[in-house]
């Protein structure tokens, strides 16, 4: 039977969501509870390490939300953004693979605000490279496992 | 070793983004620089030609952005849309496979506006069929390779 | 030749879209017309039944739209949401796998409004489990087959 292909589906660790409105690399994800799972890949300090060269489909879903009971939003005009970043350890460098998001005005009369971003794409990844997620306004992240997650699965070998 | 399955990840050619607010088929994509790549598929005049029958996962990520230093937006109420289109050459016809987007009011007090769309789906494609991307308001496209791209990878054969 | 892997791409049945602004499980999808197709999975009462254990990539694209000629929207502040739900029949239980959406103010001066949501993720599914789609404000759904759909394809076996 062929060796199982690498994959991961990682969900946000609600207990470790940073506060603030700055852009930040999310550093804590679950890999083994609820829908979260990982195989033939490694999770280290919030980064998803590739152990096997290949072409992978990468995806991320990031939800932001705010209820007026939490106080006011940091600014009337929010940039709610996600960046899927590839880091090469051998040659220390980081590059954005995918980005998505929207500017939002959450100063209105509504008591609840919500917005989700989804990105996905097909990338060549080498063993040792790492995938991480950066977001703006992390304090607005929705901590549910169905809301804020990212993942990867290997589709095929590199010739 | 089995033949490598077809795939493509195509990023927008920033130098060839059309101006205007009309709906247009984007005609120039990179296939061999940065994250862009192609294998066992063909790119011709902005259309992704299928060379091998199969079931493919298709995706697109389209980002729009505007900074007040670029002047005013073309309209207060924008329709920011993407359409993933399949064209059959044998019988000249075009059909929308997927669409996404949002109406936006970018006339507000913010000096920067941003919005991204992501669509994806699983489709049966035949050799000779072509996939292209139509957008509204092309002059607002984000030209970064992590922002505006589309792609496909073959998942399995047609029985 | 290996058995074809399970897949489905299901498009909304325009004739059966419920009215109202409440959250509802969409109960009628096409599986055999236009882009819709299914293989080694089963569609029953709007739920996509898994017949074969495996890791699947699941996705959904949901479009909402409103034209002023249809009358006013149910409320100024809309929650336009989608939930991809897994139901286990053996142990009757339902869990959200993915969610996405946005709060929207569609009370403005524009005569047309549109918004799309896309979600996707990689999940372990067991034979007998079912996937369904819940949305808020179903009366605002775009009934086109390129607009409102969901699907799944098996990526690999469970070891």
């Amino acid at each position: 039977k062929p060796e199982a292909q690498p994959f991961a589906h990682l969900t946000i660790n609600a207990a470790s969501i940073p506060s603030g409105s700055h852009k930040v690399t999310l550093s804590s994800w679950y890999h083994d509870r609820g829908w979260a799972k990982i195989s033939n890949m490694t999770l280290s300090n919030g980064k998803l390490r590739v152990n096997q060269d290949g072409f992978y489909y990468l995806y991320a879903n990031i939800c932001f939300r705010h209820h007026e009971t939490s106080g006011s939003v940091p600014t009337d005009y929010l940039q709610l953004m996600v960046y899927v970043v590839k880091t090469s350890i051998k040659i220390p460098s980081s590059h954005n693979l995918m980005k998505g998001g929207s500017t939002k005005n959450w100063s209105g009369n509504s008591e609840f605000h919500f917005y989700s971003i989804n990105v996905g794409g097909f990338f060549k990844l080498r063993a040792g490279e790492e995938i991480s997620i950066q977001v703006s306004n992390p304090s607005l992240l929705d901590p549910d496992q169905d809301a804020t997650y990212f993942g990867a699965f290997k589709v095929q070998d590199i010739d | 070793k089995p033949e490598a399955q077809p795939f493509a990840h195509l990023t927008i050619n920033a130098a060839s983004i059309p101006s205007g607010s009309h709906k247009v088929t984007l005609s120039s994509w990179y296939h061999d620089r940065g994250w862009a790549k192609i294998s066992n598929m063909t790119l011709s005049n902005g259309k992704l030609r299928v060379n091998q029958d199969g079931f493919y996962y298709l995706y697109a990520n389209i980002c729009f952005r505007h900074h007040e230093t670029s002047g005013s937006v073309p309209t207060d109420y924008l329709q920011l849309m993407v359409y993933v289109v399949k064209t059959s050459i044998k019988i000249p016809s075009s059909h929308n496979l997927m669409k996404g987007g949002s109406t936006k009011n970018w006339s507000g007090n913010s000096e920067f506006h941003f919005y991204s769309i992501n669509v994806g789906g699983f489709f049966k494609l035949r050799a000779g069929e072509e996939i292209s991307i139509q957008v509204s308001n092309p002059s607002l496209l984000d030209p970064d390779q992590d922002a505006t791209y589309f792609g496909a990878f073959k998942v399995q054969d047609i029985d | 030749k290996p058995e074809a892997q399970p897949f489905a791409h299901l498009t909304i049945n325009a004739a059966s879209i419920p009215s109202g602004s409440h959250k509802v499980t969409l109960s009628s999808w096409y599986h055999d017309r236009g882009w819709a197709k299914i293989s080694n999975m089963t569609l029953s009462n709007g739920k996509l039944r898994v017949n074969q254990d495996g890791f699947y990539y699941l996705y959904a694209n949901i479009c909402f739209r409103h034209h002023e000629t249809s009358g006013s929207v149910p409320t100024d502040y809309l929650q336009l949401m989608v939930y991809v739900v897994k139901t286990s029949i053996k142990i009757p239980s339902s869990h959200n796998l993915m969610k996405g959406g946005s709060t929207k103010n569609w009370s403005g001066n524009s005569e047309f409004h549109f918004y799309s949501i896309n979600v996707g993720g990689f999940f372990k599914l067991r034979a007998g489990e079912e996937i369904s789609i819940q949305v808020s404000n179903p009366s605002l759904l775009d009934p086109d087959q390129d607009a409102t759909y969901f699907g799944a394809f098996k990526v690999q076996d469970i070891d």
């Epitope: - | 060839s16 059309p18 101006s19 205007g20 607010s21 009309h22 709906k23 247009v24 088929t25 984007l26 005609s27 120039s28 005049n45 902005g46 259309k47 073309p74 309209t75 207060d76 109420y77 329709q79 849309m81 064209t87 000249p92 075009s94 292209s132 509204s136 092309p138 | 524009s110 005569e111 047309f112």
Partner: antibody
Framework: QSVKESGGGLVTPGGTLTLTCTAS????????MSWVRQAPGKGLEWIGY?????SPYYANWAKGRFTISRTSTTVDLKMTSLTTEDTATYFC?????????????WGPGTLVTVSL | DMIQTPASVEVAVGGTVTINCQAS??????LAWYQQKPGQPPKLLIY???TLASGVPSRFKGSGSGTQFTFTISDVECTAAATYYC????????????FGGGTEVVVK
């Protein structure tokens, strides 16, 4: 569905004229509209377009002297500093409904003559 | 801008006529063809380089992409006598004219 231009006629060089486009059978306010002109015995010349709620775009040669604007029921073309070279039939045309820059419904045209 | 050739062409009833349109830079498949008869406004025949507009007979055919486009009328009838124009529908930047110069088709 149809459109109709009005406001054409005789104007002296250096003058100003505003043409008006009205529609029946559809709403002008949610359709893109172009203006095109045709000098006697010559080809078609695109002037510019305007999208719903939006700012207009113009051909290079039309920038500055030509202004496209819209109300809820009309799309107007204002022409200033007219010369004899501007003598032409002026057409307004509705774009295809999906927003492409393809001109689907044309009016019969209105003749503008610039002469002393 | 769009270069259209020939400026005029004669064709016999039942014959075939071909008109070419060249864009100065790639416009993908963003091209339309129009028919105009004397005293009438133009009529959209083809858009997206090859898609027939509603109600247009299949003897009208468009092809090409990038910078080279072709318009063909086969099995020509007397009613095909008209002037035909191509129009790029890609970008409005630096446009002097979106239309080609036109081709007069004379049916013998």
């Amino acid at each position: 569905q149809s459109v109709k231009e009005s406001g054409g006629g005789l104007v002296t060089p250096g003058g100003t004229l505003t043409l008006t486009c009205t529609a029946s059978g559809f709403s002008l306010s949610n359709n893109a509209m172009s203006w095109v002109r045709q000098a006697p015995g010559k080809g078609l010349e695109w002037i510019g377009y305007i999208y719903p709620g939006g700012s207009p775009y113009y051909a290079n040669w039309a920038k500055g002297r030509f202004t496209i604007s819209r109300t809820s029921t009309t799309v107007d073309l204002k022409m200033t500093s007219l010369t004899t070279e501007d003598t032409a039939t002026y057409f307004c045309a509705r774009h295809v409904s999906d927003g492409g820059w393809y001109l689907y419904i044309w009016g019969p045209g209105t003749l503008v003559t610039v002469s002393l | 801008d769009m270069i259209q050739t020939p400026a005029s062409v004669e064709v016999a009833v039942g014959g075939t006529v071909t008109i070419n349109c060249q864009a100065s830079q790639s416009i993908g498949s963003n091209l339309a063809w129009y028919q105009q008869k004397p005293g009438q406004p133009p009529k959209l025949l083809i858009y997206g380089a090859s898609t027939l507009a509603s109600g247009v007979p299949s003897r009208f055919k468009g092809s090409g992409s990038g910078t080279q486009f072709t318009f063909t009328i086969s099995d020509v009838e007397c009613t095909a006598a008209a002037t035909y124009y191509c129009q790029q529908a890609y970008s409005i930047s630096n446009v002097d004219n979106a239309f080609g110069g036109g081709t007069e088709v004379v049916v013998k």
